[in-house]
């Protein structure tokens, strides 16, 4: 059982009220988490909570404001990036969200030394992407998809790329497929770490196809949006990294770096660039069959002037029983020797482990071990590692920091966090200052979210950073929901669920139980975090028992589990799903006549198949923004896990596990489709072949769209939506309003 | 030492055809950005055109941009200048030179072409 | 694109004189991007100052350049009679590279 804020007595509990949908709205209970802005070892900013930028430096206890929030707010500023050699600051502004991660924005480069703004040679607006050097105060930045260089703030340009053109080619920054499925930046360029050198990426998308939609807007006409987007099996963008000499750019030029044969030899992808010095850059390079990838280093031969990548310096990473890697192929942490690395694969076990790679991946020296997954390297120094896991008491959606001493041998573990604040902490993430000689410790949860300061050395707690007091006390007398994290073991799979109980839950009474489904491939639904959310709100007020099940597919628990739904995406995933409610079932709580279940994108797809199962479990469900065939879907995403939709591949698999195929099915279940017509990422074309194809079949079902809304539905539609859920899943269940 | 060694020039007529070549030695060529840059008799330096090691990017001067290509063959240690359409005012020594946007530090002696009826 | 306007057109000096010729171009450049190069009748340009300012190899000291922005200059501090040529600046900061019009410098 996982404790949240202690209740009070029996005396107080009329002073005691339950979640309403307006406070999940309005975000009534809404965290804060503090990660440092470190700029050095010892040193780093933070923006007030009156939008100063202030330097604090651990060392000596002082802080002082670098800018003031009237110089933000001359410019209005929404974000601010301090050069390396603290002359200069560059402040942004008119964001501009364009996809998940991208933006354009308006940048001024304010000048500390003299207190002004830098004019002369101003940059021009919107800019794509903008950077420092990591050394210095040289800017590299993104406009009109080319790239261009200033060795100072004031000085002219030098334009790299002359290429760029809008869905067209890329340069310094990722196309559509690229930053949603690949890299999960906005950026596709990387300084080398003392600024000699600049790589980026060229994505070339002349022969994508276009994805084309109607954005209606306020004009007498709709404008069409155009979006070069490889469906499974379409042709992908062509990709190429080069290398320029930022000191003398104009002499040389790029360098193109050379892509390994064994991955030249067909379709691929650039998965990503590491620097280790300024004379070696690391490569990822991955088959468009995904399941092989290759690390590729690369050094600079100044007699030749070029980007030497020998096959000896090749490091091969392949599966056999799925995909390469996790979600994504996973990125090297060099060592101090800047040729070997440590980098997180499966084991001979099945689970994704940390191995220290000296020469060959064969000759790999297991670092950690056990049926337990490393998640994430964080830092390496000359003596220690600093990684998270799921290890500590065997559960999975838990997350640990740990340091393994790298300096000794044999090389000995501590877990930093598993007993600091053992009921309140079970999920954390880190951030570490230069030579990890400070870090921030932020936990998610269960309890508050706390973010904590901590000696590199000695892992002392220094100081709280934002321990979300307000929000304590605003929950004082609120009257949360239960929550409880088990397991459930059937036919060999464990699988584990998160179940929301009403505060007053009484096991010998009967309750509404609703799914929430994601169930993606590698993905984690039943994590040890706070969440104060429409699902808490649905058992606080509603009486409604909320469960999330980690099925197979789904991440951290081994490679038998995660690789299990390879190639045949639908089916196990929907399984597991009902096999849990059976179990539940059976638990003796749950009225069986009112189940629902809903879920968003992949939930959406997982929740159709489960309503459209046969199995009569399910009274009603929604899906939202749901992806209906993988036909659909973007490649890099869809073909690393179904393969391709040939007759000589997965083609079968691909039309049998389309939500269409199931219309017929959905005559007993209440549905509701939910999605936004300006959905970039799963087209509205999903649910209008859903919709037809429930018309065809002359199945009656409920809809709602939201003009020009994307995937996340934002802003006013997040209030009508969860508005029209609730509605939905109270009359289903029989709930009064 | 580095050597450059331009050919292939000589006479032609207005809309005619020729291709110049650069036969380089001494270092790695392709490594190496190269351009070709002109000089018309009298006349001052045109950049004219430039391509980087691999032969992966290219870029012209507004004046030959549609009519000239430049190519490399880099087994071959061999640069290319394929001009067509050829115009009175091409006419001009024609140098390959060794560099990107600047710094040319190595030039070859130059060939000729001229262009007229 | 930039021009590039080099002045006087010609200079006509003693052997063992300083010469200063000048470069000023449209827009600014930054010494990152300027070279300069030297001409004799009937041969190939030979580069003199690199982009960045520094003097290409093989290049005497007396040779030296300066300047930042729009505004340059080649410094020959004693001229030796094989000085005596063309001499043009060049930029590289922009597409397309774009060369001055040259400095001719006699012997007086």
């Known amino acids: 059982i996982v404790l949240r804020p202690s209740r009070v007595h029996n005396s107080e509990e009329n002073t005691m009220r339950a979640l309403t949908l307006k406070d999940i709205l309005n975000g009534t209970f809404s965290y804060k988490t503090f990660f440092p802005n470190w700029i050095s070892g010892q040193e780093y900013l933070h923006q007030s909570a009156d939008n100063n930028i202030v330097l604090y430096n651990i060392e000596t206890g002082q802080s002082y404001t670098i800018l003031s929030n009237r110089t933000m707010k001359s410019v209005n500023a929404s974000n601010y990036g301090l050069s390396p050699d603290r002359q200069f600051v560059y402040l942004e502004s008119d964001y501009s969200k364009l996809w998940r991660y991208s933006y354009t924005a308006t940048y001024y480069i304010y000048d500390l030394s003299n207190g002004e703004f830098v004019r002369g040679n101003e940059l021009p607006r919107p800019i794509q992407y903008l950077c420092w050097s990591p050394v210095g105060s040289k800017l590299a930045y993104v406009y009109q998809n080319n790239i261009y260089l200033k060795q100072r703030p004031g000085d002219p340009p030098f334009q790299i790329t002359f290429n760029g053109r809008e869905n067209k080619i890329f340069n310094g920054i990722p196309d559509w497929v690229y930053e949603e499925e690949m890299l999960a930046t906005k950026y596709a360029l990387w300084w080398s770490p003392n600024g000699k050198f600049l790589a980026y990426a060229e994505f070339n998308d002349t022969d994508i196809p276009v994805i084309a939609y109607s954005y209606y807007g306020d004009e007498q006409y709709p404008r069409t949006i155009n979006i070069p987007y490889p469906k499974a099996g379409a042709k992908n963008p062509v990709v190429r990294i080069f290398i320029i000499d930022t000191t003398y750019p104009a002499y040389v030029g790029p360098q193109e770096v050379p892509v390994p044969a064994m991955i030249a030899s067909s379709d691929y992808y650039f998965s990503w660039l590491t620097w280790v010095t300024d004379e070696r850059v690391c490569l990822q390079w991955l088959k468009r069959v995904q399941n092989v990838s290759v690390l590729s280093i690369c050094d600079f031969r100044e007699d030749w002037q070029t980007w030497d990548c020998p096959k000896t310096q090749e490091h091969i990473e392949e599966s056999r029983t799925g995909w390469a890697g996790g979600f994504f192929v996973s990125t090297p942490v060099f060592s101090y020797d800047a040729i070997s690395y440590y980098k997180i694969f499966s084991d001979k076990d099945g689970y994704k482990h940390i191995h220290y790679i000296k020469d060959t991946v064969e000759n790999a020296i297991q670092i950690t071990s056990g049926k337990w997954e490393a998640i994430n390297i964080f830092r390496v120094t000359q003596d220690s590692l600093f990684y998270s896991s799921n290890e500590f008491e065997e559960y999975p959606g838990r997350r640990n920091i740990y340091r393994i001493s790298i300096g000794s041998y044999p090389p000995s573990k501590k877990c930093v966090t598993c007993h600091l604040r053992k009921e309140r902490c079970q999920y954390y993430t880190a951030s570490f200052s230069d030579y990890a000689k400070y870090y921030a410790l932020v936990c998610y949860g269960p309890g508050i979210p706390i973010s904590t300061l901590h000696d590199g050395r000695t892992d002392q707690e220094i100081k709280i950073l934002e321990e979300n007091k307000e929000l304590e006390n605003a929950l004082k007398n609120i009257q949360l929901p239960k929550e409880e994290i088990k397991k459930l073991e059937v036919d060999e799979i464990t699988l584990w669920y998160k179940m929301i109980l009403p505060p007053q839950f009484d096991r010998s009474k009967k309750y509404p139980l609703l799914i929430q489904v994601y169930g993606g491939p590698c993905s984690q639904s039943v994590r040890s975090v706070f969440a104060v959310n429409w699902i808490s709100y649905l058992a606080s007020k509603e009486g409604m028992v909320i469960a999330l099940v980690d099925g197979r597919g789904t991440a951290f628990q081994g490679d038998k589990l995660l690789y299990a739904v390879y190639r045949k995406l639908g089916v196990y995933e929907v399984e597991d799903q009902i096999t849990a409610v059976r179990k539940f079932i059976e638990m003796g709580f749950i009225d069986e006549k009112r189940i629902a279940i809903w879920g968003w994108s992949y939930g959406g797809y997982v929740s159709s198949l489960a309503l459209a199962s046969g199995t009569g479990l399910f009274k009603c469900g929604i899906a939202v923004a749901p992806v209906s065939s993988w036909e659909y879907y973007a490649s890099v995403y869809t073909e690393r896990f179904m393969g391709l939709p040939t007759k000589d591949d997965n083609l079968e698999h691909y039309k049998n596990s389309t939500v269409m195929a199931r219309a017929e099915y959905f005559r007993n279940v209440d549905y509701l489709l939910i999605h936004g017509t300006a959905d970039d990422n799963v087209h509205f074309q999903n649910s209008a072949q859903i919709a037809k194809a429930l018309v065809n079949a002359q199945v009656d079902f409920q809809a709602m769209w939201y003009s020009d809304q994307n995937h996340g539905l934002s802003g006013l539609s997040t209030n009508h939506l969860y508005t029209h859920m609730t509605h939905f899943l109270k009359q289903c269940f029989s709930l009064s309003d | 030492e580095v050597q450059l060694l331009e050919s292939g020039g000589g006479l032609v007529q207005p809309g005619g055809s020729l291709r110049l070549s650069c036969a380089a030695s001494?270092?790695?060529?392709?490594?190496?950005?190269m351009s070709w840059v002109r000089q018309a008799p009298g006349k001052g330096l045109e950049w004219v055109s430039g391509?980087?090691?691999?032969?992966?990017?290219?870029y012209y001067a507004d004046s030959v941009k549609g009519r000239f290509t430049i190519s490399r063959d880099n087994s071959k240690n061999t640069l290319y200048l394929q001009m067509n359409s050829l115009r009175a005012e091409d006419t001009a020594v024609y140098y390959c030179?060794?560099?990107?946007?600047?710094?040319?530090?190595?030039w070859g002696q130059g060939t000729l072409v001229t262009v007229s009826s | 694109e930039i021009v590039l306007t080099q002045s006087p057109g010609t200079l006509s000096l003693s052997p063992g004189e300083r010469a200063t010729l000048s470069c000023r171009a449209s827009?600014?450049?930054?010494?990152?991007?300027l070279a300069w190069y030297q001409q004799k009748p009937g041969q190939a340009p030979r580069l003199l100052i690199n982009?960045?300012?520094r003097r290409a190899t093989g290049i005497p000291d007396r040779f030296s350049g300066s300047g930042s922005g729009t505004d340059f200059t080649l410094t020959i501090s004693r001229l030796e009679p094989e000085d005596f040529a063309v001499y043009y600046c060049?930029?590289?900061?922009?597409?397309?590279?774009?060369f001055g019009q040259g400095t001719k410098v006699e012997i007086k």
């Open positions: 030179a060794k560099g990107w946007f600047g710094g040319f530090n190595y």
């Open positions: 001494g270092f790695t060529f392709s490594s190496y950005a």
């Open positions: 391509i980087i090691g691999s032969g992966g990017i290219t």
């Open positions: 827009q600014s450049v930054t010494s990152s991007y």
């Open positions: 982009v960045g300012s």
């Open positions: 060049q930029q590289g900061i922009m597409l397309p590279p774009t």
